[in-house]
Structure formats: C-alpha cells, structure tokens
Interface confidence: medium
C-alpha cells in the first residue's frame, strides 16, 4: 500500500522519498518565504482503516513572505541567491530531538549520511535559475533545518534518520 | 554571499573520463560537507556523491560507485569530481552544491548549488 502524491501547499514544495505507508516527509516553503510560526511542515502517509486507502495526513504549515527578503535587490545572474533565514525550531524526528552533532570522521557520522538515499530527485518545476542558487538555508541552533527552498525546486528526500550502522541499499562509504 | 562555480564539462566518448571542478566562496568551505547532484535531460536532478568537511568520508549513488570519486581541498576552497569509465546514462548538468549542516552527517540537505556544467556522454 502506497500514499498518492502529497497535496499542494502555497507557497511549497515538498521533497518526497517514499510514498510507502508511515513515511514521514516534510514540506519546505519557497525561497522569498519562511515557516509560519506554530505551524508544522511534516507529513506522513497512514491508512484509512475504514476505506484500506493510504492517504497524506493534512500538514498545517504556513508559508509567509519573509520580511527580509521583501526589501533585497535582486542579485546579478551570476550570483543568484537568497538571504537566509532562521525559522522557529520544528521537530523532524519521531522523539523530538535532533540526532547530536559528531565528528565528520566518526563512525556515526558516515551512518548518518547514509540516510541519504538512492533514486532520490529534485524536480525543477521551471528549468534551473543561472548561477548559485541556495536551496534552502541554515538550521536553527535548536538544530532543525530552514524551511526554505529554492523556488524552481520540489525536494524529494524525507527528514527520517538511520541509526548508526544502517546503510540504504544502493549507496557505499568509504572511510 | 555563496558562489559555487563549476568547470571540467564536456564531450566524452563512452568509457572516457573527465575531472570536474568546483571553485567555492563567500562561507568556511572547510566547515561544510559537499556533495554533486546531476541533471539528466528531461529528468530530475539526482545526488551523486558527497563528501565530509575534512575530507574522510565518502558516500556515492550505486550507478556511480566504483567509477567516480569525489575529493576536495580545503586550502583552495575546491571541490573535484573524477569520472571515469563514463556511459551514455551520465549525460547530464553537474551541480556542485554546499550541505546544509555544519560538521555533521544528515540527510542529503543542502542550500546553495551552482550553475552547473554539461558532461555529454556519446559515441
């Protein structure tokens, strides 16, 4: 049993990695507006127990212009970018809690990358902008990440975690 | 402000190689995991390979394993893909992009990339 595509939200995009039931996936606002305070990116796809039919649950996010954006000029081509920003911490793992930060040659830290996963894509809803575009800016200091997002992109990677030792197939680490 | 700049592109016949390069500035290259992500024509654009901070730790899709390797320099600020045993199938625009999160594994966010450069594969 598989979730249908995820429904719209204004202003977002949203990065699916698996449509399989219990995937958890965020939405992520366009470049120019940020996350709503009090509202949550996450989707997960569960099943209707009464119909047997997989389904999205209704995400309550919010995409607001960024007021710090509102006043920018816009950059040369070369040099497209966009201001970052720093939402309002939100909660992407089932506990709460981010996993800690560890040592880029740890063992743990190679496990962690290995959430990265094989097939995943970025669809450019418009053909890709020239020069450097950011994706989506930085984490808050509680450790969660931006809601931003270029606007020619639909991210398709979910905010799920690996534990340590756990590798997707279709990906090698070297050490 | 962040400018990821890429070179090395062009024309290989099947089983060939090429070097891409990526020329980054404007952050702490040295602070932040790197990756390549690709644009094939008319699909979408799919992770390649990234690459830690200082440079230890590897990670590549099963389509390029084995063939491609990616490497940096942090005293120039450089990013490199080297590609050999190149096939028709990776034609596409290569990205070089800047991970999201400092000195850390996660996901396969990331926040800027640059304009790309085509790799055209044919015989």
């Known amino acids: 049993i598989t979730c249908p595509p995820p429904m719209s939200v204004e202003h977002a995009d949203i990065w699916v990695k698996s449509y399989s039931l219990y995937s958890r996936e965020r939405y992520i606002c366009n470049s120019g507006f940020k996350r709503k305070a009090g509202t949550s990116s996450l989707t997960e796809c569960v099943l209707n127990k009464a119909t047997n039919v997989a389904h999205w649950t209704t995400p309550s996010l919010k995409c607001i212009r960024d007021p710090a954006l509102v006043h920018q000029r816009p950059a040369p081509p070369s040099t497209v970018t966009t201001a970052g920003v720093t939402p309002q911490p939100e909660s992407l793992s089932p506990s709460g809690k981010e996993p800690a930060a560890s040592s880029p040659s740890s063992n743990n830290t190679a496990a962690t990358t290995a959430a990265i996963v094989p097939g995943s894509q970025l669809m450019p809803s418009k053909s890709p902008s020239t020069g450097t575009t950011e994706i989506s800016s930085h984490e808050s200091s509680h450790g969660t990440p931006s809601q931003t997002t270029a606007k020619n992109w639909e991210l398709t990677a979910s905010a799920s975690h690996q534990p340590p030792g756990v590798y997707p197939q279709g990906h090698s680490d070297t050490t | 402000e962040v400018q990821l700049v890429e070179s090395g592109g062009g024309s290989v016949q099947p089983g060939g190689s090429l070097t891409l390069s990526c020329a980054a500035s404007g952050f702490a290259f040295s602070l932040y995991h790197m990756n390549w992500v690709r644009q094939a024509p008319g699909k979408g654009l799919e992770w390649v390979s990234r690459?830690?901070?200082?440079?230890?730790?590897?990670i590549y899709t099963d389509s390029v394993k084995g063939r491609f390797t990616i490497s940096r320099n942090n005293a120039k600020n450089a990013l490199y893909l080297q590609m050999n045993s190149l096939k028709p199938e990776d034609t596409a625009v290569y990205y070089c992009?800047?991970?999201?999160?400092?000195?850390?594994?996660?996901?396969?966010?990331?926040?800027?990339r640059g304009q790309g450069t085509q790799v055209t594969v044919s015989s």
């Open positions: 992009a800047k991970s999201t999160y400092d000195s850390r594994w996660r996901d396969h966010d990331y926040d800027y």
């Open positions: 690459i830690s901070n200082d440079g230890t730790s590897t």
